[in-house]
Interface confidence: medium
């Protein structure tokens, strides 16, 4: 009678991660008496994934019935599978023996491959805001996916960027892999309602890539501009002096009104107006009442912009001339209106 | 080199229960076979339950088997081992034991590293 031969059919086989794998294996011959073994990979080293005699095997089910006396289908699947099942996987016969049954024959080994979804891009900005004209970079991460071939692209408001670059961990062979990109990003002013977007194109996506996104809102300081005006008279003592803070990102700011150095007041913008490219405009009021100044008085509009350093505009408001209508020049723009008639 | 240490023994009354844990250093453990063996005084040491490296299939002694659990964290290096319904026989020094070697089909009879043991005292 032909010796015994383990038959392994499928060279090799490709289940999604969290699928069931099913390894094919039938013996030629019902002698020699004896159990079956599955082993992934091969040599001293090689793990016990199902043993016919004893054992546990919650994720391990055979195909067929291995009790039944003509049983020659040693197939078995196993199920939920996971990167780290991933290798190749051998049928083995062993003859019975005393006190030790002994190794007999062993199939040519299936390899199991699995393809596993890579995770939800997280992109993530600086921790610190930037002003225009500044480089930033932006990171972003995914893990879990395997075979290691991806591919990761970056868009900013639908444009693709070029300045990244990209590493997939680990280099050598893996159960699954990670992915690093850090793209490099030029601010813009009008970047308040810009987006950064991640791309991951996989095997296992079917055509249809994970994106992760960053909001720009979250990374830029537009910092403001500030003009000063002297209003017309209202009454014959006073003057009403403004001052306009445009296009400034975020909202977070203080104005400090100083006469001749002097605080006058001081307020935090509220009633904010919004411009369309997603920054805000503010304006401050200040009634000076010139009669209770001698000399000229030099009025400073000062302001602190999430928490930076503050920046100022003065005016110098003639005392001795009749009041007229006075004003520093700076670029006029989308005035905001937030009128505080305040002494 | 792989360093093994057991926790989570004690004393229990007969039908009680222990968690008994095993972390490995040194060489990663997801690489490894691992398993519980335990000596009771006078005799010679036994084999408990075994775990394979990735966990996909375990193995029990026969007076084990219904009772106890075996079970691995490979994440945190860590081998459980689940003891219920606990037997006066059941008292010993229990072992910790990684790259378990096996002959044939039979159960793991030696291993290549071994923990210092932590005790299990089961009496009323």
């Known amino acids: 009678e032909e010796e015994l031969q383990v038959i392994q059919p499928d060279k090799s086989v490709l289940v999604a991660a969290g699928e069931t794998a099913t390894l094919r294996c039938t013996a030629t011959s019902l002698i020699p008496v004896g159990p079956i073994q599955w082993f992934r990979g091969a040599g001293p080293g090689r793990e016990l994934i199902y043993n016919q005699k004893e054992g546990h095997f919650p994720r391990v089910t055979t195909v067929s019935d291995l009790t039944k006396r003509n049983n020659m289908d040693f197939s078995i699947r196993i199920g939920n599978i996971t990167p780290a099942d991933a290798g190749t996987y051998y049928c083995v016969k062993f003859r019975k023996g005393s006190p030790d049954d002994v190794e007999f024959k062993s199939g040519a080994g299936t390899e199991l491959s699995v393809r596993a979804k890579p995770s939800a891009p997280v992109v993530s900005g600086p921790a610190a805001r930037a002003t225009p004209q500044h480089t930033v970079s932006f990171t972003c991460e995914s893990h879990g996916f395997s075979p290691r071939d991806i591919t990761l692209k970056w868009f900013k408001n639908g444009n693709e960027l070029s300045d990244f670059q990209t590493n997939v961990d680990p280099v050598g062979e893996s159960v699954s892999y990670s992915i690093h990109s850090t793209a490099k990003v030029v601010l813009t002013r009008e970047d308040v309602h810009s987006q950064v977007i991640c791309e991951v194109a996989h095997v296992t996506l079917q055509g249809d890539p994970l994106r992760g996104t960053a909001n720009l809102s979250e990374t830029i300081r537009v910092p403001p501009t500030l003009e000063v005006t002297q209003q017309p008279v209202r009454a014959e003592n006073q003057v009403n002096v403004t001052c306009q803070v445009r296009k400034f990102y975020p909202q977070r700011l203080q104005l400090t009104w100083l006469e001749n150095g002097n605080v006058s007041r001081t307020e935090t913008a509220s009633t904010v107006t919004e411009n369309k490219d997603g920054t805000y405009n503010w304006m401050s009021w200040l009634l000076v009442n010139v009669s209770a100044h001698r000399d000229d008085v030099k009025l400073t509009c000062q302001v602190e912009h999430d928490g930076q350093p503050a920046v100022s505009k003065s005016h110098d408001l003639k005392v001795s001339a009749h009041p007229k209508e006075q004003g520093s020049n700076t670029a006029a723009e989308n005035t905001g209106s937030n009128e505080r008639n305040i002494y | 080199q792989v360093q093994l240490q057991e926790s989570g023994g004690g004393w229990v009354q007969p039908g009680g229960s222990l968690r008994l844990s095993c972390e490995a250093s040194?060489?990663?453990?997801?690489?490894?076979?691992m398993g519980w063996f335990r000596q009771a005084p006078g005799k010679e040491r036994e084999f408990v339950a075994g775990?394979?490296?990735?966990?996909?299939?375990?193995y029990y002694a026969d007076s084990m088997k219904g009772r106890f659990t075996i079970s691995r964290d490979n994440a945190k290096n860590l081998v459980y081992l689940q003891m219920n319904s606990l037997k006066s026989e059941d008292t010993a020094v229990y072992y910790c034991?990684?790259?378990?070697?096996?002959?044939?089909?039979?159960?793991?009879?030696?291993?290549?590293?071994w923990g210092q043991g932590t005790q299990v005292t089961v009496s009323s």
């Open positions: 775990i394979s490296r990735t966990g996909i299939s375990a």
């Open positions: 034991a990684a790259a378990l070697t096996f002959r044939g089909s039979d159960l793991p009879r030696d291993s290549n590293y």
């Open positions: 040194g060489r990663t453990s997801s690489s490894l076979d």
